[in-house]
């Protein structure tokens, strides 16, 4: 997260760290007791690593009573996701067992009504992604509030040049932005999950390159079918 600040500890009990061989790779969001939603591209570089999900964490390194690492039983990328586009960049991870819920571990309601979030709405994005262009990684969860940007502006030739589909949304990226390592994490508007940070190699913190988020409401049928 660029231009953000440390989050209040455990105030985002839905927040997940998707890890490979014990290292944070991407964000994720607990959407059901045994399921975490993230971005499909996140695992492309997981290779033969052990994929796990950390729940109930604020610090990645320090012991915390609520922290627990879960093995992944099944990784389900969206069937239309592919390596060379950010379209359909969603991944569902089934935990090896139901998460132990509590004040620091709780699923987040996700948007089912397929309607664009009003431009200008302030939404919260959180993650353990890099906090500087030099690539410094935080130990503790960071967050930032970002205004939603209308699709027409986001699709301008000077911005994302038509790449933003109806199934994506944008947020402003003027020095405050999601960045590498935040992919798969939640964009939360009004206490509801609206978007998932896409995992392209986009430049961060440049206002001409807004943050791109996959709209979960557009994938309600798929999410329901996997969780069923």
């Amino acid at each position: 997260i660029l231009g953000g600040r440390e989050a209040e500890a455990h105030a985002r009990p839905y927040m997940a760290s998707v890890q490979v061989n014990g290292e944070h790779l991407c964000g994720g969001v607990l959407v059901a007791e045994q399921w975490v939603l993230s971005a499909a591209h996140c695992l492309e570089d997981a290779a033969d690593g052990k994929v796990q999900v950390l729940l109930g964490a604020h610090s990645l390194s320090q012991p915390e009573p609520s922290k627990r690492l879960y093995d992944v039983l099944r990784a389900v990328p969206h069937p239309d996701s592919r390596p060379d586009t950010i379209d359909h960049d969603l991944l569902l991870l089934q935990l090896s067992e139901k998460a132990t819920l509590g004040p620091a571990v709780r699923p987040l309601p996700w948007q089912r009504v397929d309607r664009d979030v009003e431009p200008g709405t302030l939404c919260d994005v959180a993650g353990w992604g890099i906090v500087s262009h030099a690539g410094r990684r935080p130990d503790r969860l960071q967050h930032v509030l970002l205004p939603v940007l209308d699709r027409a502006t986001c699709n301008r030739r000077t911005h994302h040049d038509g790449a933003i589909t109806q199934r994506m949304m944008c947020a402003e990226s003027n020095r405050r932005d999601s960045c590498k390592g935040d992919s798969g994490g939640p964009l939360v508007c009004g206490g509801v999950l609206e978007g998932v940070v896409t995992s392209g190699s986009r430049v961060c913190g440049n206002r001409k390159k807004p943050g791109i988020y996959t709209r979960v409401a557009s994938y309600a049928a798929w999410i329901d079918s996997v969780l069923a």
């Epitope: 997981a46 033969d48 690593g49 052990k50 990784a75 990328p77």
Partner: antibody
């Protein structure tokens, strides 16, 4: 650039031995599972062996046709993959490819191959 | 072992035509993790094989959208909507759900 380069092929007599090598570059070799796939002259592809990464205890798997005769191994410090072939048979004559194994998919990067000929 | 049977063995086509290759497995290739590891590879003359389709229907990087994969259980199909000269070669299906992993016998796509 991601690259796999095989070496060590050649002519060997039946019941003889040969060790194939594969030099990997351009990616984090130690995190990937690796495979050997072969192709007999004018024939189709046949998976031979797979070795997983350290995080999966270097687990190995083999095709029934080579079990107990071939051994797959790796040296992560040198980014090298090996195939030790013992008790070779004429039916082992083939082009041997070193192949990287992805997460969502299997064989995403292939070497150019090295030829093994088993003949008396 | 899972036997992968491809048909036809040879497929003569005219450029611009649609081509369809079938692959049938001797048993279900749904993995214990719920995914179906069915892939398609193309080997052009004198070259190493290249991955086209993974998990039944997902196109790999750089693969044109004229290639599509479908199927489930034991029956799978690769379709090329408009064959181009660069598509000629031998197509192989592959299952990675059960060890030992197995390839189909191959289908040679050639000009009519």
């Amino acid at each position: 650039e991601v690259q796999l380069v095989e070496s060590g092929g050649g002519l060997v007599q039946p019941k003889g031995s040969l060790k194939l090598s594969c030099a990997a570059s351009g990616f984090s070799f130690n995190t990937y599972a690796m495979n050997w796939v072969r192709q007999a002259p004018g024939k189709g592809l046949e998976w031979v062996a797979r070795i997983r990464s350290k995080s999966n205890n270097y687990a190995t798997y083999y095709a029934d046709s080579v079990k107990d005769r071939f051994t797959i191994s790796r040296d992560d410090s040198e980014s090298m993959l090996y195939l030790q072939m013992n008790n070779l048979k004429t039916e082992d004559t083939a082009m041997y490819y070193c192949v990287r194994h992805g997460y969502y998919w299997y064989f995403d990067v292939w070497g150019t191959g090295t030829t093994v000929t088993v003949s008396s | 072992d899972v036997l992968m049977t491809q048909t036809p063995l040879s497929l003569p086509v005219s450029l611009g035509d649609q081509a369809s290759i079938s692959c049938r497995s001797s048993q279900s290739i749904v993995h214990s993790d719920g995914n179906t590891y069915l892939e398609w590879y193309l080997q052009k003359p004198g070259q190493s094989p290249k991955l086209l389709i993974y998990r039944v229907s997902n196109r790999f990087s750089g693969v044109p959208d004229r290639f599509s994969g479908s199927g489930s259980g034991t029956d799978f199909t690769l379709k090329i909507s408009r064959v181009e000269a660069e598509d000629l070669g031998v197509y192989y299906c592959f299952q990675g759900s059960h060890v030992p992993y197995t390839f189909g016998g191959g289908t040679k796509l050639e000009i009519k």
